[in-house]
């Protein structure tokens, strides 16, 4: 088999809500992936599992099943949403995210995604990790690639 390429493109949107009493932040983060099938036969994207980390703590997980079939020599763009919760020992972030005196409330999140594809009964997993900026202070729609956080921690691809 030839390669199936998975490219994490970035955060597409982040929608924020708060629980004032619990000092909790709810972030619904939609991400975009490009999956390219370089084979001469179709492959099925069986599932996508994703998790989001803030400060080395997992704050959200998601799993999508039976997503799509990608034809040979074809590419599909897939969006997936991870609901995240910043609470409890990280409730100090509530003050930062709701601070009126600053315009942009960017936090750095690590996006991890694993794509499982199948073909001819064979299964293959491809994983990616990316650090991204997300504004926890307002609903934001991003230009693809705009939210990328570039620093020495960013895994090389």
């Amino acid at each position: 088999p030839r390669s199936i390429d998975v490219k994490y493109i970035g955060v597409k949107s982040a929608y924020v809500s708060y629980d004032v009493q619990k000092r909790t932040i709810y972030l619904n983060i939609t991400n975009t992936l490009n999956i390219t099938n370089n084979n001469y036969y179709s492959v099925e994207v069986e599932n996508i599992t994703a998790q989001v980390q803030f400060s080395k703590t997992v704050i959200g997980k998601a799993r999508l099943n039976n997503i799509t079939i990608i034809g040979p020599l074809d590419m599909k763009q897939i969006d997936y949403t991870v609901p995240t919760v910043i609470a409890e020992e990280m409730s100090y972030m509530y003050d930062f995210c709701t601070l009126i005196s600053i315009k942009v409330h960017n936090i750095v999140l690590m996006m991890q995604v694993t794509v499982t594809t199948t073909y001819f009964g064979h299964s293959e997993q491809i994983s990616q990790e990316r650090y991204q900026y997300v504004d926890c202070g307002r609903n934001t729609t991003y230009q693809l690639g705009q939210s990328e956080y570039l620093n020495v921690l960013q895994p090389q691809q």
Epitope: I69, G71, L73, M75
Partner: antibody
Framework: QVQLQQSGAELVRPGTSVKVSCKAS????????IEWVKQRPGQGLEWIGV????????DYNEKFKGKATLTADKSSSTAYMQLSSLTSEDSAVYFC???????????????WGQGTSVTVSS | DIQMTQSPSSLSASLGERVSLTCRAS??????LNWLQQEPDGTIKRLIY???SLDSGVPKRFSGSRSGSDYSLTISSLESEDFVDYYC?????????FGGGTKLEIK
């Protein structure tokens, strides 16, 4: 019934280009790949490349990169192969062939075009 | 690239005779092999796919088999229209490669 109808014979000058067509009928054009194969006079068969007419995605034999360009027009169910900077080495019969695919099976080149003769001569 | 060595390059045989043509793969190709027939006017037809599966409309006298890296096309009883050219094709990996061909001639 399934048919791949190729364009007629071409006599072309060295250094020029030629575009060979392969019109598909009798099946859903975008559900199959189209492959292209070269046969020099009195010789064997050589694989050039493949196109997915649905996506426009292509893959080429390294040997033919820069020489052949594969395209497809969904509206007319026609695949094309353009050959550029022609030399006498490009004089050959060129075939298109259909390639069924799914995520379960892959049994290529089940139907073939009749071939297009390209002669490069000054 | 995977090399497909086809033998013999030409074969003289009589009507009704049983003949076998062979292709040897330089690397493992599993069952990803076709046998093709080319008539004198250039028309190409697939006879066998996946090593041993007969295409619809192909006479039962044609059969395909495998032994290790050797792939065979057998014609059990030659008829007049069988005296044409035959090629094997591997599609296990890119680029696809063909055998050099066998010219089947009437004795």
């Amino acid at each position: 019934q399934v048919q791949l109808q190729q364009s007629g014979a071409e006599l072309v000058r060295p250094g020029t280009s030629v575009k060979v067509s392969c019109k598909a009928s009798g099946y859903a054009f975008t559900n199959y790949l189209i492959e292209w194969v070269k046969q020099r006079p009195g010789q064997g068969l050589e694989w050039i490349g493949v196109i997915n007419p649905g996506s426009g995605g292509t893959d080429y034999n390294e040997k033919f990169k820069g020489k052949a360009t594969l395209t497809a027009d969904k509206s007319s169910s026609t695949a094309y192969m353009q050959l550029s900077s022609l030399t006498s080495e490009d004089s050959a019969v060129y075939f298109c062939a259909r390639d069924p695919y799914s995520k379960y099976v892959h049994y290529p080149m089940d139907y073939w075009g009749q071939g297009t003769s390209v002669t490069v001569s000054s | 690239d995977i090399q497909m060595t086809q033998s013999p390059s030409s074969l003289s045989a009589s009507l009704g005779e049983r003949v076998s043509l062979t292709c040897r793969a330089s690397q493992d190709i599993g069952s990803s092999l076709n046998w093709l027939q080319q008539e004198p006017d250039g028309t190409i037809k697939r006879l066998i796919y996946a090593t041993s599966s007969l295409d619809s409309g192909v006479p039962k006298r044609f059969s395909g088999s495998r032994s290790g890296s050797d792939y065979s096309l057998t014609i059990s009883s030659l008829e007049s229209e069988d005296f044409v050219d035959y090629y094997c094709l591997q599609y296990a990996s890119s680029p696809r490669t063909f055998g050099g061909g066998t010219k089947l001639e009437i004795k």
